[in-house]
């Protein structure tokens, strides 16, 4: 089977959503956990993560082969404390298989804005607190 993990971010007003999406087959969901770590280059695990989620066992319909499971970590107001390196990972508690997504970073600037870099879908995202828009 093939399990794919991607990272993305979205902004809703002052909130920043960090999203880990895993695409997988039904039969691959058993025992799999997706999790998001911060500043954990070597020991990212469900136990040290910011949030974890078990993969869906059911896509909700029967006419599809793949399921997407989505972990969303919401930062209500980004502060300098949120600056750092983040990574989406997944692990099977049955087989021990580990998946590691690309590292991405939040950089809080002196002007009160923040930048998210390293995301594969959008190479560079900049968010402004003052205007609350994607800049």
């Amino acid at each position: 089977g093939c399990i794919n993990i991607t990272s993305s971010a979205s902004q809703e007003g002052t909130r920043l959503n960090l999203i880990c999406t895993v695409w997988h087959k039904k039969e691959e969901a058993e025992g799999f956990v997706v999790f998001l770590c911060k500043d954990r280059s070597g020991d990212c695990s469900p136990e040290t993560s910011l949030k974890q989620l078990r993969l869906k066992r059911d896509p909700g319909i029967d006419g599809v082969g793949e399921i997407s499971s989505q972990l969303m970590f919401t930062i209500s107001q980004v502060t300098p404390l949120h600056s750092g390196t983040y990574q989406c990972c997944a692990r099977s508690q049955k087989s021990g298989i580990r998946l590691q997504g690309h590292f991405f970073s939040i950089l809080f600037t002196e002007t009160g804005n923040y930048t998210v870099t390293g995301l594969k879908q959008r190479q560079h995202l900049e968010f402004s607190h003052n205007e609350g828009t994607l800049s």
């Epitope: 039904k26 989620l53 319909i61 029967d62 006419g63 989505q70 972990l71």
Partner: antibody
Framework: QVQLVQSGAEVKKPGASVKVSCKAS????????MQWIRQAPGQGLEWIGS????????RYTQKFRGRATLTADKSTSTAYMELSSLRSEDTAVYYC??????????????WGQGTTLTVSS | EIVLTQSPATLSLSPGERATLSCRAS??????LHWYQQKPGQAPRLLIK???QSISGIPARFSGSGSGTDFTLTISSLEPEDFAVYFC?????????FGGGTKVEIK
């Protein structure tokens, strides 16, 4: 045993909103899709949408997108369906129902008792 | 959206007779079809899953068949408690949809 217990009957005025709850017990709430279905008096069954409480993935039929909001509270194993901008045509019995695990059951194997919504000025 | 068309809308039969209910899908849905029974004032009850698979606790007189676009629910010998409304429902794709229902009434 699996049980879905819904909130009581509601009477609302046109333009108002309603939030119906469905408390689940007897199974792992986060592992199953919860459906919301309605039935107008003397009519058939109409699927509104469904939510997967494990990751809050929600799907809606086009007719209700933007007017219905499905949520789930993992801590209390309760699913909610909020319907806004109510009109008289929304008068119906609203059901929550659990979808059985794919390829094993697939259909809606457990149903709530139904919540009657009356929209009248 | 997959449209499910049930026929007939009403079926008038006597106890002991055989009932044959039809459900037709607007496009192929493999065997991803389920049947429900609903009695007045009650929530629907799952009768048959995946077109032909039986459900624990449902009498053996209820059976289902079909695949693709044409499906049939058969009640081999109607009992008094079987007079009700029957719905089909597809789980092949979003949005999930129901058929309009067939009412089985006493002749």
């Amino acid at each position: 045993q699996v049980q879905l217990v819904q909130s009581g009957a509601e009477v609302k005025k046109p333009g108002a909103s309603v939030k119906v709850s469905c408390k689940a017990s007897g199974y792992t709430f986060t592992d199953y899709w919860m459906q919301w279905i309605r039935q107008a008096p003397g009519q058939g069954l109409e699927w509104i949408g469904s939510i997967y409480p494990g990751d809050d993935d929600a799907r809606y039929t086009q007719k209700f997108r933007g007017r219905a909001t499905l949520t789930a509270d993992k801590s209390t194993s309760t699913a909610y369906m909020e319907l806004s901008s109510l009109r008289s045509e929304d008068t119906a019995v609203y059901y929550c129902a659990r979808r059985g695990i794919a390829a094993v059951v697939g259909g809606f194997d457990y149903w709530g008792q139904g919540t009657t919504l009356t929209v009248s000025s | 959206e997959i449209v499910l068309t049930q026929s007939p809308a009403t079926l008038s039969l006597s106890p002991g007779e055989r009932a044959t209910l039809s459900c037709r899908a607007s496009q192929s849905i493999s065997n991803h079809l389920h049947w429900y029974q609903q009695k007045p004032g009650q929530a629907p009850r799952l009768l048959i899953k995946y077109a032909s698979q039986s459900i624990s606790g449902i009498p053996a007189r209820f059976s289902g068949s079909g695949s693709g676009t044409d499906f049939t629910l058969t009640i081999s010998s109607l009992e008094p408690e079987d007079f009700a409304v029957y719905f089909c429902q597809q789980s092949n794709s979003w949005p999930l949809t129901f058929g309009g229902g067939t009412k089985v009434e006493i002749k």
